[in-house]
């Protein structure tokens, strides 16, 4: 399965649900389908309010049942890990893919655990992290935001995506704006941030 | 290089049964899920069903619900689909195809079933 | 297991470019977008030429691109070129892979 390289912004942005849960044991196949679902306890819901209406929280993951169809394979057996898991809502369903956005909640930087839960979405639908893979690249828009990691650090993992949001500079214009405490108090975003 | 070789062209009678194999090579065998395809002589592709060699678990098309099975021998990475009471219109090439999440990659050069008194 | 739709012939000349249609309902084409489509030459297994609606397979040229508006898929290959000439069958799949269902098959001739 090739997944390209996401920003937690965008994987935010892009997913229907955002939720932390924890996984509950070994995945069960669904009869007559390519499908099989993880037991989760969900420990709180970070994206899809909406989406999900009056249900109360989600007890299973859905997830193709092979790697060849890019399932997601669950390799912790730690079941009082939480995961932060970025999915999509199918059928009244949350889906998984093995290019999903799944990872330890304690292996995000603190700078991204505070924009999963408040940050991020003051870009959606606005901003867009638009992946530099090769030099030269250029903006194509005012409301993209260049992100290098990949060429800069070698890796999806760099310091724009530990630590930045693309987020409104105004209505036109979106920009890197660091994540850290220190300075977002005094970026614009107290009324994106509330 | 994925491979998908089936057996041999068969004649059978009408409500005999036929075992078409599909043996797999150049991939993880039980990475994959395996679906079975017909054609009949100038006629279109029709989908009969598919198994997961992992499991063994199957689905087949409505169609051949009763009358098809889907086995699989990991061993020997090989895949099965036996049709049981075979009527004239049955006759038609049997392709087996690798499923991936790209759709049917890979497929088997075909069998050809002939049903005739 | 209903079938879905496709002309049962097309043409065109060397160079010029031809679309095949593939209407379903909204339980199949039109509710996701798992539409594929394949070629066929004579006495030849099928091989995937578009995944996903409009994505191609590596080694697949440029020249085949597929879409998709409401319960109607379209495969369109421009610059057709003499080994075109083949049958070509769109295929459509559920969520789960519950079930697949194939195009009755459209066979495409290049003049």
């Known amino acids: 399965c090739s997944c390209a390289p996401t920003h937690p912004q965008t994987a935010f942005c892009n997913s229907d649900l955002v939720i932390r849960a924890k996984f509950m044991g070994s995945p069960e196949i669904i009869e007559t389908t390519l499908y099989q679902r993880y037991e989760i306890k969900m420990t709180k819901m970070l994206k899809g309010f909406d989406a999900v209406g009056n249900a109360t929280g989600f007890r299973f993951a859905y997830t193709p049942a092979m790697e060849s169809l890019c399932g997601y394979v669950h390799k912790s057996q730690n079941r009082s890990e939480e995961f932060l898991i970025a999915g999509r809502l199918r059928n009244g369903n949350l889906h998984i893919t093995a290019c999903s956005f799944l990872v330890p909640w304690h292996n995000l930087s603190p700078a991204q655990q505070k924009a999963f839960v408040k940050t991020y979405s003051a870009g959606c639908g606005v901003c867009t992290v638009f992946p530099c893979s090769a030099i030269p690249c250029k903006l194509e828009s005012d409301s993209h935001c260049l992100w290098t990691d990949q060429i800069l650090m070698g890796s999806e993992k760099g310091y724009q995506s530990d630590h930045f949001a693309c987020l409104p500079r105004n209505p036109d214009l979106c920009t890197w704006q660091y994540l850290g405490v220190s300075m977002t108090r005094s970026l614009p975003l107290a009324k994106a941030e509330a | 290089q994925v491979q998908l070789v089936q057996s041999g062209a068969e004649v059978k009678k009408p409500g005999s049964s036929v075992k078409v194999s599909c043996k797999a090579s150049?991939?993880?065998?039980?990475?994959?899920?395996i679906s079975w395809v017909r054609q009949a002589p100038g006629q279109g592709l029709e989908w009969m069903g598919w198994i997961n060699p992992n499991s063994g678990g199957t689905n087949y098309a409505q169609k051949f619900q009763g009358r098809v099975t889907m086995t699989r021998d990991t061993s020997i990475s090989t895949a099965y689909m036996e049709l049981s009471s075979l009527r004239s219109e049955d006759t038609a090439v049997y392709y087996c195809?690798?499923?991936?999440?790209?759709?049917?990659?890979?497929w088997g050069q075909g069998t050809l079933v002939t049903v005739s008194s | 297991d209903i079938a879905l739709t496709q002309p049962a012939s097309v043409s065109g000349s060397p160079g010029q470019s031809i679309t095949i249609s593939c209407t379903g309902t909204?339980?199949?084409?039109?509710?996701?977008?798992?539409v594929s489509w394949y070629q066929q030459h004579p006495g030849k297994a099928p091989k995937l030429m578009i995944y996903d609606v409009s994505n191609r397979p590596s080694g697949v040229s440029n020249r085949f691109s597929g879409s998709k508006s409401g319960n109607t898929a379209s495969l369109t290959i421009s610059g057709l070129q003499a080994e075109d000439e083949a049958d070509y069958y769109c295929?459509?799949?559920?969520?789960?892979?519950?079930?697949?269902?194939f195009g009755g098959g459209t066979k495409l001739t290049v003049l």
């Open positions: 150049g991939g993880t065998f039980s990475s994959y899920a």
């Open positions: 195809a690798r499923i991936t999440y790209i759709g049917y990659d890979f």
């Open positions: 295929q459509s799949r559920d969520l789960y892979y519950v079930y697949y269902v």
């Open positions: 909204s339980s199949d084409v039109g509710g996701y977008n798992y």
